[in-house]
């Protein structure tokens, strides 16, 4: 390891640090109503929240980024909260021949980290 | 594809959007001078810049996130600029038995995208 240890407790208070949150979105919200038929409403898990020093660091690069942000905040951005993994979703959509099912492996976040 | 097409031209002006930038850092900056011997200074490529709508979207989730951020900016954060790939780096460091070389695969960014 890079001698900097990521931490999992949020120093900013409950719900403030990088975490998974469910956002309801309709096909209209996504601009997909012309080609996706179902489901009409999606429960989209997204990564939200701040990434204070060493919180849920994705890897060595993120640990370094957090450290350098502390030293040069104008030059190096803080790590930010992004998906670490995804959960597949099946959508029913229009095709030339009718309706078909398709899986999307990168649509809904399953876990988050700071990168 | 998810019928939302990522774009590669920056609408904010040159150098403003998500890109790779080199940051010089010493072992002291990183807090590594007690265990890494060489190199004394690292050229660290990092991802910096903004992620305007559809710019360099990492995947379907990022495209959706950009769209929902436009609709619910207080609820859904904009995508942010993170590494899409890394380049390995070899460091010379102290061990109990002397000096050894170790490869770090996740230390220096090689490419960036908006996630």
């Amino acid at each position: 390891s890079a001698h900097l240890h990521p931490r999992d407790s949020c120093p900013l208070g409950p719900g403030r640090c990088c975490h998974l949150e469910t956002v309801q979105a309709t096909l209209e919200d996504l601009g997909w109503s012309d080609w996706v038929l179902s489901p009409r409403q999606l429960q989209l898990s997204m990564c939200v929240g701040e990434c204070p020093h060493l919180y849920r660091s994705a890897n060595t690069h993120a640990l370094i980024k957090a450290r350098l942000h502390g030293l040069q905040p104008d030059r190096v951005p803080a790590p930010c909260c992004v998906p670490s993994s995804y959960t597949p979703v099946v959508l029913m959509h229009r095709t030339d021949s009718g309706v078909s099912l398709q899986t999307y492996d990168d649509l809904v976040a399953q876990g988050c980290h700071c990168a | 594809s998810a019928h939302l097409h990522p774009r590669d031209s920056c609408p904010l002006g040159p150098g403003r959007c998500c890109h790779l930038e080199t940051v010089q850092a010493t072992l002291e900056d990183l807090g590594w001078s007690d265990w890494v011997l060489s190199p004394r200074q690292l050229q660290l490529s990092m991802c910096v810049g903004e992620c305007p709508h559809l710019y360099r979207s990492a995947n379907t989730h990022a495209l959706i996130k950009a769209r929902l951020h436009g609709l619910q900016p207080d609820r859904v954060p904009a995508p942010c600029c993170v590494p899409s790939s890394y380049t390995p780096v070899v460091l010379m460091h102290r061990t109990d038995s002397g000096v050894s070389l170790q490869t770090y695969d996740d230390l220096v960014a090689q490419g960036c995208h908006c996630a």
């Epitope: 038929l37 489901p39 409403q41 429960q43 959960t87 099946v90 029913m92 899986t103 | -």
Partner: antibody, heavy 119, light 110 residues
Framework: EVQLVQSGAEVKKPGESLKISCKGS????????IGWVRQMPGKGLEWMGV????????IYSPSFQGQVTISADKSISTAYLQWSSLKASDTAMYYC????????????WGQGTLVTVSS | QSVLTQPPSVSGAPGQRVTISCSGS????????VNWYQQLPGTAPKLLIY???NRPSGVPDRFSGSKSGTSASLAITGLQAEDEADYYC??????????FGGGTKLTVLG
């Protein structure tokens, strides 16, 4: 409590028609897809098709396309599986099952409807 | 012939650990999650494990799932008489959508 209650066992002759039902309760019926699964005597599970009860969009397994019709009546929270002309080889247990949130698995199952086709 | 291959039967004594394998290909298990169902004699199938390794509430932690490459497995520890059942794996296949394994009959010895 989520429940899927299927109609009772049926004994039919070859060439006859049949419609079996699956009534959902304890959840928003139109928010989840319903699938149908066949289990022939002593055999494994076979996916037949799926319906979105909110828009009545259906998709069939290639093996069952044209052999059966899946429908739904959202006003009474019920999905259906029907045959216009039964064959002896349609003898099986038929299960309806609700899809999980992201459509990749079946989280609740009906108790099954046994269909026997014999002359 | 099922798209996903399971052993027809496995057995174990009470208290033992047994595993049931499910072998697929790059067009099914290789790209999507695997789910497991338990079918007790004379009853409907019940969801046992979803998305490779998640247990629905009410399923004992003696049951666990894992996936590696194009294969998956279900492990049952501390085998009990009431675990005697048929077990099915299920995934998604790009050509035929939802696919099941042929099923594995678990016999608890003694």
């Amino acid at each position: 409590e989520v429940q899927l209650v299927q109609s009772g066992a049926e004994v039919k002759k070859p060439g006859e028609s049949l419609k079996i039902s699956c009534k959902g309760s304890g959840y928003s019926f139109t928010s989840y897809w319903i699938g149908w699964v066949r289990q022939m005597p002593g055999k494994g599970l076979e996916w037949m098709g799926v319906i979105d009860p909110s828009g009545s969009y259906t998709i069939y397994s290639p093996s069952f396309q044209g052999q059966v019709t899946i429908s739904a009546d959202k006003s009474i929270s019920t999905a259906y599986l029907q045959w216009s002309s039964l064959k002896a080889s349609d003898t099986a247990m038929y299960y309806c099952a609700r899809y999980g949130r992201y459509g990749t698995y079946f989280d609740y199952w009906g108790q099954g409807t046994l269909v026997t086709v014999s002359s | 012939q099922s798209v996903l291959t399971q052993p027809p039967s496995v057995s174990g004594a009470p208290g033992q650990r047994v595993t049931i394998s499910c072998s697929g290909s790059s067009s099914n298990i290789g790209v999507l999650y695997v789910n497991w169902y338990q079918q007790l004699p004379g009853t409907a199938p019940k969801l046992l494990i979803y998305s490779n390794d998640n247990r629905p509430s009410g399923v004992p932690d003696r049951f666990s799932g894992s996936k590696s490459g194009t294969s998956a497995s279900l492990a049952i520890t501390g085998l009990q008489a009431e675990d005697e059942a048929d077990y099915y794996c299920q995934s998604w296949d790009s050509s035929s959508n939802y696919v099941f394994g042929g099923g594995t009959k678990l016999t608890v010895l003694g």
